[in-house]
């Protein structure tokens, strides 16, 4: 649960100010751009040559509680004939994201940032390794 | 800067507890799973049939300060011959992510969550609309 180097300076007050009480910060309620949404996808997960499924994970002590993870459906990619071509590879595209973890002991509630690895979708790539016979 | 419906309950204390002072919460220092990383990509952004470039945006009052956005390089997809096939489409894969915004007025520092739309990469899809001659 360490703070990465960049975070160490980010969470500090300017040098000329009295230092922050060790261990916690003030988090304002509300979310900036809360209504921002991913545009409707038009089923790209089904129409892609590297299609994927979605699994929803749910955790009531996390914000957002619902996190969607993608899983590539194929080892290869779907060709023009709709068949799987295993000489191409479906690979996951991943993103590091922040979520907010709620922790409570009795009536004392605090929050902490948590880094999460999310698989957002899949893309079709030319394999780097070809078997030499 | 409103709190979405899910967030309204997430940020509340249990009903049996005295309510939170309106407007701010306690954010613990440190990031859970801070060392979690996207695995090395093996240049999937170049090897993909829907390749993309990256642009880095930097904001010293945001955590993380560095956010990477992808842009699809082609309208179509790259075929086996390395040529662009305009009968297929490169489309962006987007993800809603949270960042932490730092706000200061003099020596008073507070933080607020912000929702950000990140383009993580691109995938190749069969177009929905085909031109009829």
């Amino acid at each position: 649960q360490r703070v990465p180097k960049e975070g160490q300076t980010f969470f500090q007050k300017p040098e000329s100010c009295p230092s922050v009480p060790e261990g916690s910060l003030k988090l304002d309620l509300g979310i900036i751009n809360a209504n921002q949404r991913v545009p409707l996808s038009r089923n790209i997960e089904r129409r892609s040559t590297s299609p994927w499924n979605y699994t929803v994970t749910w955790d009531p002590n996390r914000y957002p509680s619902e996190v969607v993870q993608a899983q590539c459906r194929h080892l290869g990619c779907v060709n023009a004939q709709g068949k799987e071509d295993i000489f191409m590879n479906s690979v996951p595209i991943q993103q590091e994201t922040l979520v907010l973890r709620r922790k409570h002991q009795g009536c004392s509630v605090s929050f902490q940032l948590e880094k999460l690895l999310v698989t957002v979708g899949c893309t079709c790539v030319k394999p780097l390794i070809h078997h030499v016979h | 800067q409103r709190v979405p419906k899910e967030g309204q309950t997430f940020f509340q204390k249990p009903e049996s507890c005295p309510s939170v002072p309106e407007g701010s919460l306690k954010l613990d220092l440190g990031i859970i799973n801070a060392n979690q990383r996207v695995p090395l990509s093996r240049n999937i952004e170049r090897r993909s049939t829907s390749p993309w470039n990256y642009t880095v945006t930097w904001d010293p009052n945001r955590y993380p300060s560095e956010v990477v956005q992808a842009q699809c390089r082609h309208l179509g997809c790259v075929n086996a011959q390395g040529k662009e096939d305009i009968f297929m489409n490169s489309v962006p894969i987007q993800q809603e992510t949270l960042v932490l915004r730092r706000k200061h007025q003099g020596c008073s520092v507070s933080f607020q969550l912000e929702k950000l739309l990140v383009t993580v990469g691109c995938t190749c899809v069969k177009p929905l609309i085909h031109h009829v001659h």
Partner: nanobody, 123 residues
Framework: EVQLVESGGGLVQAGGSLRLSCAAS????????VGWFRQAPGKEREFIGA????????YYAVSEKDRFTISRDNGKNTLYLQMSSLKAEDTAVYYC????????????????WGQGTQVTVSS
């Protein structure tokens, strides 16, 4: 970071069956292609087969298609290998492996490997 631990190996009579399991730790198991290899004494490591992240797509090395079945349970972070009609030549150490690209896994260049579990078939 993915850790893989195989189990279920042992001694079995020819013609018998065995189910191997591979338990994965790590939060993003379902983003990995996972598969099985085996290595018989004095031989090279041999690819058995692999399964996609969602479990929809499975590829077998031609020789094992009929007797071996690969499956996964993403809820349990576990990969399985069901083996039937076992023969003496199936005696080997069986390895579970994971990678985000099938092309790497298929040719034995995966990022993650288990320690292996011994299967001995007596005739």
């Amino acid at each position: 970071e993915v850790q893989l631990v195989e189990s279920g190996g042992g001694l079995v009579q020819a013609g018998g069956s065995l189910r191997l399991s591979c338990a994965a730790s790590g939060r993003t198991f379902s983003s990995y292609v996972v598969g099985w290899f085996r290595q018989a004494p004095g031989k090279e490591r041999e690819f058995i087969g692999a399964i996609s992240g969602s479990g929809d797509s499975i590829y077998y090395a031609v020789s094992e298609k009929d007797r071996f079945t690969i499956s996964r349970d993403n809820g349990k972070n576990t990969l399985y290998l069901q083996m039937s009609s076992l023969k003496a030549e199936d005696t080997a150490v069986y390895y579970c492996t994971a990678d985000q690209e099938f092309g790497y896994l298929r040719f034995g260049r995966s990022e993650y490997w288990g320690q292996g579990t011994q299967v001995t078939v007596s005739s």
